[in-house]
């Protein structure tokens, strides 16, 4: 059996070397001479020769200083043989523990640590954490037991101890009130890490703390009184620019200004914020009326996009806005005038009077009337009174100029102000119908096939309105009934069916068709009928010799 006591060896020993560690014994040495040897890391494998053993005595020796931070434990095997070289013992594992010396100082993980904290943060607010490491043994010794301290703070304002550091964790916290970004936006701390619980080796690093902005400063008007002027009736006109200062961080919601007009119930003004310089741009939201009010005194308040973090006074400004008088156009009353008149209204008679009012009550002005648009040239106006008369016959069925029985004319009124101003009124003449149109057929050109012809539907059109329209009466005249027949196609008699009585020669025919409306107004229309060399339904076919009264006349 082996006799091996526990083995430990301090690192960094002085010498002289080799130095005895322990004597190894085998019980077999009573039976004869025993020879000792060792194998393993530090003996016969790298690092080779750190440990040796005296062959005959069994003394285990170290040959050089050890470094725990490089190798903390060596595992060797001891061997015992007799003089003839036979093993007298099984190999035995030997553990050599290198004991620690405080030969490493702490090291910070960064040279500079960065953190941030909101201004106004209360004591106890965590800011950041610094971390250091130590290579020494932190299990069996205090050689790696690090303690953190703050060595200095720059600036030392408003207090030299604004922050504290947890000795054990390295967490930096606020310890004193009074952090103010606008006064001291950054702090630089020199922090120390020392082993042996602060009594041993030490090192330093820098912690840079940025104080972040909160909305603890209001925007303030400078100046607080303004003057501006604006012409009446004009919207979106810039009146003046309002100036503010805000100590908070530029181009942040805590700096950006929001303007509110406190006494603009009518919503006549608006203040927008210039995003570049935070100015307030006061403009008209709608046209102002000089005749109604000549001056406005506005009270404008300014706040930020985000609420104030602390109780702050809201800054206000006073703006005096003078409204400038402008010559305004006369206004027709009503702007659109509807007048009902029969389409057979007498030429030269007065239809209506259409006048305008002068908005410029502070000026004595004369109004002159003119017709601006009268596409059919039916009207004339008295320039002084606005009386409108007919100069030509009206026609409800003039569909180029009349839409839905309504003729639209534009009348203008011009004052004698400086500069001259002109207003426009719309005159709607609602033309009532008279029975001045006889019915007409549509189409007037018809095609039939000579063989197996398909009857053709002819629509009856009357430009008038009921009761001057359907039911219509149709009749073939001038001998057309010899070759052709008609019958009504629908109960309202608004269309007829035309067909030949017998086979007709290919060629062109003229059929006289008399159409009469419900009020007995009639008209004879000539239908142009072509009989084509085809069967069934006719397309368009070539023109042949004309035929009078539905009877073909030889050439």
């Amino acid at each position: 059996d082996w006799v091996i006591p526990p083995i430990s060896c301090p690192e960094n020993e002085k010498g002289p070397f080799p130095k005895n560690l322990v004597q190894i014994k085998s019980n077999k040495d009573k039976e004869g001479k025993v020879f000792y040897s060792i194998t393993g890391q530090g003996a016969d494998t790298p690092p080779v020769g750190v440990f040796i053993i005296e062959r005959e005595t069994g003394w285990l020796k170290v040959t050089e200083p050890l470094d725990r931070e490089r190798i903390a434990t060596y595992t060797l095997f001891s061997h015992a043989v007799s003089s003839n070289g036979n093993a007298v013992e099984d190999p035995m594992e030997i553990l050599i523990t290198v004991t620690d010396q405080n030969d490493n100082k702490p090291e910070f993980t960064q040279e500079v640590f960065k953190g941030s904290v909101m201004e106004g943060a209360l004591p106890g607010t965590s800011v950041m954490e610094v971390t250091a490491t130590d290579a020494d043994d932190d299990v069996n010794t205090y050689n790696a037991a690090i303690a953190y301290t703050i060595l200095s703070q720059d600036p030392e304002l408003p207090d030299k101890n604004m922050f504290t550091i947890n000795r054990n964790t390295g967490v930096i916290s606020v310890v004193t009130t009074g952090l103010d970004r606008e006064s001291f936006p950054t702090y630089t701390l020199v922090v120390q890490a020392a082993d042996l619980q602060g009594e041993g080796l030490s090192t330093t690093a820098t912690a840079v703390i940025t104080v972040t902005d909160t909305n603890d400063n209001p925007p303030i008007f400078n100046p607080t009184t303004y003057k501006g002027q604006v012409p009446e009736n004009e919207a979106n006109v810039v009146i003046t620019t309002l100036k503010v200062t805000d100590a908070d961080a530029p181009n942040t919601p805590a700096w950006e200004a929001v303007y509110t007009i406190l006494n603009d119930d009518g919503g006549q003004f608006v203040v927008t914020t210039n995003p570049v310089n935070n100015d307030g741009i006061l403009k008209t939201a709608k046209g102002l009326d000089f005749e109604a009010k000549q001056q406005y005194i506005l009270h404008v308040a300014v706040t930020n996009v985000v609420p104030f973090e602390v109780s702050l006074t809201t800054s206000t400004a006073t703006v005096t806005v003078d409204v400038l008088d402008v010559n305004e156009a006369p206004i027709f009353v009503p702007p659109e005038k509807r007048v009902e008149v029969s389409e057979d209204f007498g030429v030269g008679q007065e239809i209506t009077s259409y006048t305008a009012q002068e908005p410029d009550t502070f000026m004595e002005q004369k109004i002159t009337y003119r017709i601006w648009r009268d596409t059919a040239n039916w009207l004339e106006i008295n320039p002084d009174t606005g009386a409108i008369s007919t100069r030509a016959e009206l026609d409800r069925e003039d569909f180029e100029h009349v839409k839905n029985s309504t003729y639209t004319a534009l009348i203008i009124a011009t004052d004698n102000g400086s500069p001259v101003a002109t207003g426009t009124g719309t005159l709607l003449l609602i033309l009532s119908d008279v029975n001045d149109n006889a019915p007409i057929p549509e189409p007037r050109t018809i095609f039939f096939c000579e063989r197996n012809p398909k009857p053709q539907v002819i629509n009856i059109i009357d430009a008038d309105l009921p009761p001057n329209t359907s039911p219509f009466t149709a009749e073939l005249t001038h001998g057309a009934s010899a070759n052709w027949t008609i019958q009504y196609n629908d109960p309202t008699q608004e269309s007829i069916i035309l067909k030949p009585k017998m086979a007709l020669e290919v060629g062109d025919y003229k059929i006289n068709l008399k159409l009469m409306d419900n009020q007995n107004k009639d008209q004879v229309t000539t239908l142009e009928v072509s009989v084509c060399d085809c069967e069934g339904a006719a397309g368009v076919c070539r023109k042949a010799q004309p035929v009078e009264a539905g009877l073909q006349i030889p050439a």
Epitope: N452, A503, C534, E535
Partner: antibody
Framework: EVQLQQSGPDLVKPGTSVKISCKAS????????IHWVKQSHGKSLEWIGR????????TYNQKFKDKAILTVDKSSSTAYMDLRSLTSEDSAVYYC?????????????WGQGTLVTVSA | QIVLSQSPAILSASPGEKVTMTCRAS?????IHWYQQKAGSSPTSWIY???NLASGVPTRFSGSGSGTSYSLTVNRVEAEDAATYYC?????????FGGGTRLEIK
């Protein structure tokens, strides 16, 4: 009932002429066209032309305009077809026909046919 | 002029069979009219305006088509249907007839 009665068969010499008749009955003779159709032996039908008893107008198939002359005798309600300058090619059965209506493009009523044989 | 081509030239069928004969026009026509002609007799109007049966024609006959393609169909052929059938157009002058289809009953 509408009837078209044609004249009997004819055997004629080449170069001569023949006149075929078609007597209409059972309707107003002037109200409808009379058409003439040729059918060569074992062959199809060919339209020769038509005559309008209403206005004495004729319409011919270009192929037969120098071969046939169409006439009518309104007093006897009879239609005639003269065939001239006969050759063996003219040997055929010739039919007169009319439509149900004056403007029909098809032929509802047919005569019994007249066989014309051209032979030396 | 419009040329009408009929096919087949001869059509042979047993009683009760369904048969169809066609008529093709060299250009589009509005209608086709059909005639039946038995040996030694005049033609008889059979179908007019493409699909209308003439008076007395059995309902087993029908006509259809448009443009340039038309047909006559006999649903269940009978011995009395043996004849030559001609198609005819008059969409343009002169009216023309097809060459005929001879229907034989076995």
């Amino acid at each position: 009932e509408v009837q078209l009665q044609q004249s009997g068969p004819d055997l004629v010499k080449p170069g001569t002429s023949v006149k075929i008749s078609c007597k209409a009955s059972g309707y107003s003779f002037t109200a409808c066209y009379i058409h003439w159709v040729k059918q060569s032996h074992g062959k199809s039908l060919e339209w020769i032309g038509r005559f309008s008893p209403n206005n004495d107008r004729t319409t011919y198939n270009q192929k037969f305009k120098d071969k046939a002359i169409l006439t009518v005798d309104k007093s006897s309600s009879t239609a005639y077809m003269d065939l001239r300058s006969l050759t063996s090619e003219d040997s055929a059965v010739y039919y007169c026909a009319r439509g149900e209506e004056s403007w029909d493009a098809w032929f509802t009523y047919w005569g019994q046919g007249t066989l014309v044989t051209v032979s030396a | 002029q419009i040329v009408l081509s009929q096919s087949p030239a001869i059509l042979s069928a047993s009683p009760g069979e369904k048969v169809t004969m066609t008529c093709r026009a060299s250009s589009s026509v509005s209608y086709i009219h059909w005639y039946q002609q038995k040996a030694g007799s005049s033609p008889t109007s059979w179908i007019y305006a493409t699909s209308n049966l003439a008076s007395g024609v059995p309902t087993r006959f029908s006509g259809s088509g448009s443009g340039t393609s038309y047909s006559l169909t006999v649903n269940r052929v009978e011995a009395e249907d043996a004849a030559t059938y001609y198609c005819q157009q008059w969409s343009t002058t002169p009216p023309t007839f097809g060459g005929g289809t001879r229907l034989e009953i076995k």
